[in-house]
């Protein structure tokens, strides 16, 4: 159940997709990736207020218990709901190869 | 890739399964659930230090970028990797029914 997409904290403050530019050095990939040398990393960032983009029943429970016991139970967290594939040209023992990674870049976000 | 299960922050401080006792009132279910009247909610709580239980490549990237830009990129978050089903006896217009929920109780945790 993908709940409300209205952010009560103000525009852009709640869980959504962000793009962060990163070099191979930033990612710790410089010793095994040849291309691309800069990655536009898409990731899920932002707050998860009550029922905002709740991924499932578990997220709804978490919201309820966080309200009751904020020191014990954390609020739901903004994480990828799905991923986009990304292809890397990487070094191998014999030369180079193209490798597709399916769990590298976030496509869509929800709270869980 | 399920990375290291050794918690550098000390025993029990990192991402793991916790059990929280909750009443139907706590969960906001009192008006539609008949049983159980108390739920042992299993949820994922704890810190996600570098490479601890990294769910996938995205979690590894997030760790790297959080180290570089802690104010922009949050650390990975402790969320369910899988769920246990739970059966609720719930009120219906005509009486009661047994309903199985597959996304309610965490079974296993990882960082993402």
């Amino acid at each position: 159940a993908r709940n409300g997409d209205h952010c009560p904290l103000g525009p852009g403050r709640c869980c959504r997709l962000h793009t962060v530019r990163a070099s191979l050095e930033d990612l710790g990939w410089a010793d095994w990736v040849l291309s691309p040398r800069e990655v536009q990393v898409t990731m899920c960032i932002g707050a998860c207020p009550s029922q905002f983009r709740a991924a499932n029943m578990h997220a709804q429970i978490k919201t309820s218990l966080h309200r009751l016991k904020p020191d014990t139970v954390p609020a739901p967290c903004c994480v990828p709901a799905s991923y986009n594939p990304m292809v890397l040209i990487q070094k191998t023992d014999t030369g180079v190869s193209l490798q597709t990674y399916d769990d590298l870049l976030a496509k869509d976000c929800h709270c869980i | 890739a399920r990375n290291g299960d050794h918690c550098p922050l000390g025993p029990g401080r990192c991402c793991r399964l916790h059990t929280v006792r909750a009443s139907l009132e706590d969960l906001g279910w009192a008006d539609w659930v008949l049983s159980p009247r108390e739920v042992q909610v299993t949820m994922c709580i704890g810190a996600c230090p570098s490479q601890f239980r990294a769910a996938n490549m995205h979690a590894q990237i997030k760790t790297s970028l959080h180290r570089l830009k802690p104010d922009t990129v949050p650390a990975p978050c402790c969320v369910p990797a899988s769920y246990n089903p739970m059966v609720l006896i719930q009120k219906t217009d005509t009486g009661v029914s047994l309903q199985t929920y597959d996304d309610l109780l965490a079974k296993d945790c990882h960082c993402i």
């Epitope: 010793d31 040398r37 800069e38 180079v96 870049l105 | -």
Partner: antibody, heavy 119, light 112 residues
Framework: QVQLQQPGAELVKPGASVKMSCKAS????EGWYIHWVKQRPGQGLE????????????NHAQKFQGKVTMTRDTSSSTAYMQLSSLTSEDSAVYYC????????????WGQGTTLTVSS | DIVMTQSPSSLSVSAGEKVTMSCRSS???????????LDWYQQKPGQPPKLLIY???NRAHGVPDRFTGSGSGTDFTLTISSVQAEDLAVYYC?????????FGGGTKLEIK
């Protein structure tokens, strides 16, 4: 089968704009960049810019500043390049090609769209 | 911008002969790990270009092994060990070391 499909030709009047399409199939559209390359009749190849379908971010050669706008529609796996204020200098074949990133070789090319700017 | 210069601009050889063509860049294309951001393309009449060699020496999928790329820094060579009639084309080198990506002027190969 991995391919990039482009319309064969466009005939446009000077001063007008044109929006060319490049439809990807046979691979995950958002996993690769789309680059655009210009080739004037009997001339060499000229890189125009790239579009990252995953984010919508673009980059183009300074020479084409104000001339080119690159967009994409992920629902139809199609990249677009719009050229504005057309002159005879814009008459050329325009190719789209895919690359792993901004700095990677172009392993698949479209057949090209021949743009003719004429009154 | 990096200027790419190819020579000769054209050459005519008989089938079975060995051919070499040169590509020179105005600055080094060498990056880490000893790879150069230099690719070679073949364009037959009335067709789009086709990738032959990427990252200075790696044959693209399906390219016959008579095509070989070599060189480093600013000087690169494409060698066709035994020219076939179907190799009639213009050959372009391209640098993707930095933006804007630039192509050489091409070498036109004619078969006697």
């Amino acid at each position: 089968q991995v391919q990039l499909q482009q319309p064969g030709a466009e005939l446009v009047k000077p001063g007008a704009s044109v929006k060319m399409s490049c439809k990807a199939s046979g691979y995950p559209f958002e996993g690769w960049y789309i680059h655009w390359v210009k080739q004037r009749p009997g001339q060499g190849l000229e890189w125009m810019g790239w579009n990252n379908p995953r984010t919508g971010l673009t980059n183009h050669a300074q020479k084409f500043q104000g001339k080119v706008t690159m967009t994409r529609d992920t629902s139809s796996s199609t990249a677009y390049m719009q050229l504005s204020s057309l002159t005879s200098e814009d008459s050329a074949v325009y190719y789209c090609a895919r690359g792993v990133g901004a700095d990677a070789a172009f392993d698949i090319w479209g057949q090209g769209t021949t743009l003719t700017v004429s009154s | 911008d990096i200027v790419m210069t190819q020579s000769p601009s054209s050459l005519s050889v008989s089938a079975g002969e060995k051919v070499t063509m040169s590509c020179r860049s105005s600055q080094s294309l060498l990056w880490k790990h000893g790879y150069n951001y230099l690719d070679w393309y073949q364009q037959k009449p009335g067709q789009p270009p086709k990738l032959l060699i990427y990252l200075d020496r790696n044959r693209a999928h399906g390219v016959p092994d008579r095509f070989t790329g070599s060189g480093s820094g600013t000087d690169f060579t494409l060698t066709i060990s035994s020219v076939q009639a179907e190799d009639l084309a213009v050959y372009y080198c391209m640098q993707s070391f930095e933006t804007p990506i630039t192509f050489g002027g091409g070498t036109k190969l004619e078969i006697k």
